[in-house]
């Protein structure tokens, strides 16, 4: 017989399966051009020696044999006596150490009988229904296929699971969707219906991440307030990276998660935009207000759980920056501009109450005036810091206000509403004798010391209702008692107390009278 | 709902032909391979064969060879098995079953009895 | 072709937990699907692929698998739990599907 042809005469060699475990198995015979077949086969146990033999029956019942030696893969022609129209049934005998081992057979029309491709195109990924789909296009003249797709995670070995019959020009396969861990895919694929048809090779990996994206685990931390009113935010740890199964390790597109970073500025509500989003790794320069930060974490399946902190205000005051003048037609107020065309935010509320309830007034975009200096004026119409308390007020700015990272914090200081001068005229004025020639003046303290930096000073003042001399002695915000001294027995005084602002006089409490009583020796 | 709805219970004589059918509803009949399972009184389950139904391709277990076929007609949706050369060994609850991604039966028709007695 | 070996019977107490093992060559490439089948109904799916339930399946029934074996384990069994048990797998070598010989399970 010629070595390209089957062979129909009896192999040389006895006809006795052994029924030995190992031998040869998997026999895989297809089509592989117009006119030529391949058939391969694989062989369990040790090779040396092992001389392989392809048999093939025909339909009339005829048989024939192609002598393989030791290779497990043999080609030939339509030409070779072998009917590839049609159907036909094919096994390997292998001869090893004296006995014969036999693969199960095939059955199969071996003209038809095409080898399969494994998706190769883009394969689309989506979820439905808490499972994975997979969607690609079928290769070009392989409608109808079986299709099996394998699948791992990190820690566990591969397995097998099935798509389905596929029948179509797009081919689609259900899998299963890990929650919290990233998976690869291979997708394989063989003719659908023919026995002994040999599976294609294995896709190339499709990494998929988990339903759930991790968790970010990142800590911020926040500078000191700037000279140009900009702390920066800063990242102390990294987000934890996703394990990867090992055909996704490198370059792996489908499980990448990504971190934004979302600002929610809670100070100065009646700004135009509260809340913005970035990227991580882009990490702002933030004003001194109070903000909500959050980190989402997302994958290609949407957005996972975030983490969220709260950066409180920077409480840092000013004491002098800010200038209040109160006129009879209203307030103003007069700080240093910063730039040309600011746009600035005034806020307020009261001091010792909930931040919920601060009060804000934008301003159009200003440039300085002559003097270097920014203003907000209101009228008392407005009742805007009209009651007579503490505020704290604090003023932003921004040259783009609709970006919620351009803004700074200008200042921050506190300012007694109303009319401030007379709410702040401390009460409760006594004299008390100290010495023969000195008494001791106390008070209750001014509501403006409730306002930190507003009470510039107290100022006792004391007539002495013979002479009308009258002398004044500045005493320290933080004091409430004062000694006057040189005063002469038998005379009558009158004390009076008032507390001063920077930009303000207070009202003189009601005139208190009193008088050093003469001593009288024995 | 997802559903496989079987025929009425059969008594055969020995060397007779049953055919069991198996209606689907409630899915893509052509998308999911349909298998029958029997089971013989007091005894395990048996995997018999499986169909594909987009198109009509068969496997069957090497036991049933040459005596089990089984068709689809895509138009009712429905899947049928016949068993020829019957004996009183192949009396038993036949079972068509639905296969997921896991080659396991999610969906089971609810059995048709088949009694093979002379 | 593969085969699937279960033991034929296991006891367990009621509330008590309760494993029952499913052995062949062919767990070590495909996931095992587990079935109840409770006397003149037909099979129940109970657990398939890694461990999955399908709805209406109580949480008390889980699944694992490791190398050439495929486990059930009923965490708390219940006297409703009381049944025959079967595996299943695809056969490693060919296209066909196989089950193991089931398992009765009492509840004492």
């Known amino acids: 017989c010629r070595t390209s042809e089957c062979c129909f005469q009896d192999p040389p060699y006895p006809d006795a399966d052994s029924g030995s475990a190992s031998g040869p198995r998997d026999l895989r015979c297809y089509r592989i051009s117009s006119d030529r077949y391949e058939c391969s086969w694989q062989y369990e146990g040790p090779t040396a020696g092992v001389s392989h033999f392809l048999r093939c029956c025909l339909s009339s019942g005829r048989c024939c044999y192609f002598a393989a030696g030791s290779a497990t893969r043999l080609q030939f022609s339509d030409q070779a006596g072998v009917s590839v129209l049609y159907t036909v049934t094919l096994w390997v005998e292998s001869w090893a150490r004296n006995q014969t081992e036999k693969s199960p057979e095939v059955t199969l029309q071996l003209y038809n009988s095409v080898k399969y491709e494994p998706p190769l195109g883009d394969i689309k990924v989506s979820k439905l229904a808490g499972q994975l789909r997979m969607e690609w296009e079928t290769p070009d003249n392989q409608v109808g296929a079986e299709v099996q797709f394998r699948h791992r995670t990190p820690s566990s070995p591969w397995k097998l699971g099935d798509c389905g019959p596929q029948d179509d020009d797009t081919e689609s396969c259900l899998c299963p969707l890990e929650m919290n861990v990233a998976q690869e895919f291979q997708l394989r694929r063989r003719q659908l219906g023919s026995q002994g048809s040999s599976w294609s090779k294995w896709s190339s990996p499709v990494c998929v991440p988990p339903e759930n994206p991790p968790q970010p685990q990142v800590r911020f931390s926040v500078e000191q307030l700037g000279q140009d009113g900009r702390r920066r935010l800063t990242l102390k740890e990294q987000p934890t990276q996703l394990e990867l199964p090992e055909g996704c390790q490198g370059l792996a597109p489908g499980t990448e998660v990504t971190y934004r970073l979302q600002l929610h500025m809670l100070s100065c509500p009646c700004k135009a935009k509260a809340t913005r989003t970035l990227h991580l790794g882009k990490m702002p320069y933030l004003s001194g207000a109070a903000y909500n930060v959050a980190v989402i974490s997302s994958n290609q399946f949407g957005p996972g759980l975030n983490q969220t902190w709260h950066i409180p205000a920077d409480t840092h005051t000013e004491p002098v920056a800010l200038n209040i003048s109160v006129g009879t037609n209203g307030t103003t107020m007069y700080w240093p501009a910063r730039a040309q065309s600011m746009t600035y935010c005034i806020e307020w509320q009261p001091v010792g109450q909930d931040g919920g309830l601060a009060t804000c007034s934008l301003t159009a975009p200003q440039d300085p005036d002559p003097a270097g200096m920014a203003t907000y004026s209101w009228s008392r119409e407005s009742g805007a810091m009209g009651q007579e308390k503490c505020y704290y007020i604090t003023i932003f700015a921004s040259a783009h206000p609709e970006k919620l990272t351009l803004w700074s914090t200008v200042l921050s200081t506190y300012h007694f509403g109303g009319n401030a001068s007379a709410a702040g005229t401390p009460h409760h004025v006594s004299v008390k004798n100290h010495s023969l020639d000195s008494v001791s003046v106390d008070w209750a303290p001014s509501l403006l010391s409730t306002c930190p930096g507003v009470l510039k000073e107290y100022v006792v003042r004391c007539r002495d209702e013979d002479s009308k001399q009258v002398s004044e002695h500045p005493v320290q915000p933080t004091e409430t008692q004062v000694t006057l001294s040189g005063l002469r027995a038998g005379v009558a005084y009158t004390v009076q107390v008032r507390a001063d602002t920077a930009w303000l006089r207070g009202v003189w409490s009601q005139p208190q009278r009193f008088s050093i009583e003469v001593q009288v020796s024995d | 709902q997802v559903q496989l709805v079987q025929s009425g219970a059969e008594v055969k004589k020995p060397g007779a032909s049953v055919r069991v059918s198996c209606k689907a509803s409630?899915?893509?009949?052509?998308?999911?391979?349909i298998h029958w399972v029997r089971q013989a009184p007091g005894q395990g389950l048996e995997w018999m064969g499986i169909i594909n139904p987009s198109g009509g391709s068969t496997s069957y277990a090497q036991k049933f060879q040459g005596r089990v076929t089984m068709t689809r007609d895509t138009s009712t949706t429905t899947v049928y098995m016949e068993l020829s050369s019957l004996r009183s060994e192949d009396t038993a609850v036949y079972y068509c079953?639905?296969?997921?991604?896991?080659?396991?039966?999610?969906?089971w028709g609810q059995g048709t009895m088949v009694t093979v007695s002379s | 072709s593969s085969e699937l070996t279960q033991d034929p019977a296991v006891s367990v107490a009621l509330g008590q937990t309760v494993r029952i093992t499913c052995q062949g060559d062919?767990?070590?490439?495909?996931?095992a699907g587990w079935y109840q089948q409770k006397p003149g109904q037909a099979p129940v799916l109970v657990i398939y692929g890694k461990n999955n339930r399908p709805s209406g399946i109580p949480d008390r029934f889980s699944g694992s698998s490791s190398e050439d074996t495929a486990s059930l384990t009923i965490t708390g069994a219940q006297a409703e739990d009381e049944a025959d048990y079967y595996c299943n797998s695809r056969d490693s070598s060919d296209n066909h599907l196989v089950f193991g010989g089931g398992t009765k399970l009492t509840v004492l």
């Open positions: 409630g899915y893509t009949f052509t998308s999911y391979y």
């Open positions: 079953a639905k296969s997921n991604w896991a080659y396991a039966f999610d969906i």
């Open positions: 062919s767990l070590s490439s495909y996931y």
